[in-house]
Interface confidence: low
């Protein structure tokens, strides 16, 4: 028996359902009583789901997995993972044994989009050219870790005096806070771009400092 899976990682958004595709080619006369199917975490060998002795043995992994029972006899051994969490990320191995045995691994990459950044300025009044200001760009609830880029009004990257921190909440999602310290020119626009490297999603925020008032 030959097991086939997607070579590309499966990308799943947090709280959505994901299908980890796995298939085999059944011989003529194949019956489910002959099938032993096991899904497990590749690295730790933890059992996720199994089908043995002619029946679905159910989920061994937080009760959020399911097979496609009507499609098994056609060679579809795919696994449905419901309400995906950050902790589900990783490699899953599909083992199929009929008379002989084969296995293959498929990777699950979890992702969550970042919110539109909010911009704050300190100090936020009585600003004059030559003043040092601190601009903070905050974006929330994304995954995996963000890449943060700063640019001035002409699109020139600002790399000096940038400090970025990312904190995970109890669900494993990241809040990113990036701080730019800059000396004010006469007029200036400062833009922050928060990029999700998996989704290739960019979230933009900017602040324009003129004489007054401030524009966000």
């Amino acid at each position: 028996v030959e097991v086939q899976v997607s070579e590309d990682p499966v990308v799943a958004l947090v709280d959505t359902d994901a299908t980890l595709r796995c298939s085999f080619s059944p011989e003529p006369g194949f019956s489910l009583a002959q099938l032993n199917l096991i899904w497990q975490l590749t690295d730790t060998k933890q059992l996720v789901h199994s089908f043995t002795e002619g029946r679905d043995q159910g989920s061994a992994y937080s009760n959020r997995t399911a097979l496609f029972p009507d499609l098994l006899v056609q060679g579809n051994a795919s696994l449905r993972l419901q309400r995906v969490r950050v902790t589900d990320e990783g490699s899953y191995t599909c083992f199929v044994s009929i008379q002989d045995f084969d296995s293959a691994a498929v990777s699950l990459q979890v992702a969550a989009p970042y919110s539109k950044p909010s911009m704050t300025l300190e100090p936020n009044k009585d600003l004059r050219p030559g003043n040092m200001v601190t601009i903070t760009c905050s974006s929330y609830q994304g995954y995996p870790e963000a890449e943060v880029f700063w640019k001035d009004g002409q699109g020139v990257p600002l790399t000096g005096n940038v400090t970025t921190s990312q904190m995970a909440n109890e669900r494993g999602l990241f809040d990113v806070h990036s701080v730019l310290r800059v000396v004010l020119g006469a007029n200036g626009t400062y833009s922050c771009l928060v990029r999700n490297p998996v989704l290739q999603q960019d979230a933009h925020g900017s602040v324009t400092i003129t004489g007054q008032p401030l524009t966000f």
Epitope: D43, T44, E89, G90, Q109, Y143, P144, E145, A146, E147, S165, Q166, M167, A168, E170, G172, P197, V198
Partner: antibody, heavy 120, light 108 residues
Framework: DVQLVESGGGVVRPGESLTLSCAAS????????VSWVRQAPGEGLEWVSG???????YYADSVKGRFTISRDDSNNTLYLQMNSLRAEDTAVYYC??????????????WGLGTLVTVSS | EVVLTQSPGTLTLSPGERATLSCRAS??????LAWYQQKPGQAPRLLIY???TRATGIPARFSGSGSGTEFTLTINSLQSEDFAVYYC??????????FGGGTKVEIK
Amino acid sequence: DVQLVESGGGVVRPGESLTLSCAASGFTINSYAVSWVRQAPGEGLEWVSGISGSGVRYYADSVKGRFTISRDDSNNTLYLQMNSLRAEDTAVYYCARSNKVTWNNFFDYWGLGTLVTVSS
Amino acid sequence: EVVLTQSPGTLTLSPGERATLSCRASRSILTSLAWYQQKPGQAPRLLIYNTVTRATGIPARFSGSGSGTEFTLTINSLQSEDFAVYYCQQYYDWPPLTFGGGTKVEIK
């Protein structure tokens, strides 16, 4: 088989620099997070720095601004550039792999470590 | 940062006895806790992660329990190869990732 092999340790004077390397095999270094963890003689473990699969870098406060973590994907190698070394940086430095793309996790594989001694 | 406090500092036991090691977090880390074993001159070795899950190849005599701020590593029927230093590590609130100070399990 997953393997991590550190090198580059040695004896340096306070204020000097050193670069540690960690050659990884058995996995692709940009598909996992990898960290540096150190252990001073007779002491416990201290996380120093980590880099996620997507290249985001983090540092312990004790080394921020002095140490730089980086990697060379083509050579599957992790680096730790250590500047302005102090006596308290003396330790065995371990390279450790997280079992996920993001580094905020436990470490399932460790190297054997390389000893850095900072002494005048 | 989350501070992990391990107790006791040293545990002196005979082979065949049960070892109970404690790790206390300064604030809740849910179940994001791992345990490592380290022998002299060797790198740490992962034993337990997510508080209760044994790593690949770890014998069933090692078990973990707890949640929130109180965690326990239990080694049933100590074998000669189990005498080592044990560290807990949290990965819930970071940076930084933090380790406990260690518990040495030594032969009586």
